[in-house]
Amino acid sequence: MGNSCYNIVATLLLVLNFERTRSLQDPCSNCPAGTFCDNNRNQICSPCPPNSFSSAGGQRTCDICRQCKGVFRTRKECSSTSNAECDCTPGFHCLGAGCSMCEQDCKQGQELTKKGCKDCCFGTFNDQKRGICRPWTNCSLDGKSVLVNGTKERDVVCGPSPADLSPGASSVTPPAPAREPGHSPQIISFFLALTSTALLFLLFFLTLRFSVVKRGRKKLLYIFKQPFMRPVQTTQEEDGCSCRFPEEEEGGCEL
């Protein structure tokens, strides 16, 4: 018992002596955060000058405070022990570590391109004022059906697969009427209506696709992640939409 007590005391003395010799060798190690070791004044600890800070002890200089100017605004003021923190003014959002950049907001249903804010292409959406347009979820990949159609601002909502729909549940396509004798004119007119609707849809789709192809060729966009601050666009919407494939990080696309 006495032996172990002796060991503890010896260790404590050793540690205390080490700390003493270390501070004798390097008096700067005693300087706390918010101060710096002033070589010009016999290495005494001097407080950081205004607009500077030191976040750790034993520093020989204080760092200049970050200034939140222009589109940046101060989220946290600089103190003698910590740097200022910035965020972006409304209409802009932060990018990069510690909000090193501010990027212009667009509207939901748009994305920011080199030429400003562009509407999302058909089949893509952006539910935020920042970021890129992303493809609608493909419900069929999960064996589900589309419950709510997608828009430029919102993704599709997937529902149960058509097979899972219980009898009596409302279905998009009406069930085919039962074949009964003496009802052939109704059946014929029903199928005629169905075929003409399908043809109309096909015609509409082809027209739409042709116009998108033409427009896509007319305006090939180079889309990039902006390394600088964009000026605020006074007119956010231009004609045309910004098209990209999901796997593309940069560059435009032709439909």
């Epitope: 989220r75 965020d87 409304p90 570590a97 939901q108 539910d127 920042r130 992303r134």
Partner: antibody
């Protein structure tokens, strides 16, 4: 379907630590900031912390700054909140919430953290 | 930090009533304000974003208005499922502050 599921809550002594997790599914995780919001029993909502989609910018309420650390693992679609130096006033249900344009459009069901000796 | 003050703290109303809840900010938050509904034991649900935009799937009886410092949430005709606590939240500053809440109870 967007889902957020919190876990890791429990009883802890004052001064103790805890790590909360929030597993996300049904959306592109990296495209959204995620936040922690807490609610003390019988009280209102209090924003705690937030992190950007890339994980490179973090935000904290003054009441937790220096004690709590928010992080995310985008490869696992998981958000974390490390709670250190816990106090009795940290007792609350902790919700993770997806940020869409600075508002919170989807919330988890919450996990209860009780700080008591 | 920006403070949000809701009024009233609680109110009693009947089904079919028109209900108005106000939220006042200690400084201008532009239109960066959202409204949430919370029922006991459940997570909050987003109702209104950007002060006046109705969130997808939220009934049209809910509406929001205002900008700057004064905001209003209106329920045009109160339904049984609307009895809950309502919170406003500002996102003008990155410290997303919430109002203290307004409890809507059955009269």
């Amino acid at each position: 379907e967007v889902q957020l599921v919190e876990s890791g809550g429990g009883l802890v002594q004052p001064g103790g630590s805890l790590r909360l997790s929030c597993a996300a599914s049904g959306f592109t995780f990296t495209s959204y900031g995620i936040h922690w919001v807490r609610q003390a029993p019988g009280k209102g909502l209090e924003w705690v912390s937030g992190i950007s989609g890339a994980g490179d910018t973090t935000y904290y309420a003054d009441s937790v700054k220096g004690r709590f650390t928010i992080s995310r693992d985008n490869s696992k679609n998981t958000l974390y909140l490390q709670l250190n130096s816990l106090r009795a006033e940290d007792t609350a249900v902790y919700y993770c919430a997806r940020e869409r344009d600075y508002d919170f459009d989807y919330w988890g069901q919450g996990t209860l953290v009780t700080v008591s000796s | 930090d920006i403070q949000l003050t809701q009024s009233p703290s609680s109110l009693s109303a009947s089904v079919g009533d028109r209900v108005t809840i106000t939220c006042r900010a200690s400084q201008s938050v532009s239109s960066y304000l959202a409204w949430y509904q919370q029922k006991p034991g459940k997570a909050p649900k987003l109702l209104i974003y950007d002060a006046s935009n109705l969130e997808t799937g939220v009934p049209s009886r809910f509406s929001g208005s205002g900008s700057g410092t004064d905001f209003t949430l209106t329920i045009s005709s109160l339904q049984p499922e609307d009895f809950a606590t309502y919170y406003c939240q500002q996102s003008y500053s990155t410290s997303h502050t919430f109002g203290q809440g307004t409890k809507v109870e059955i009269k």
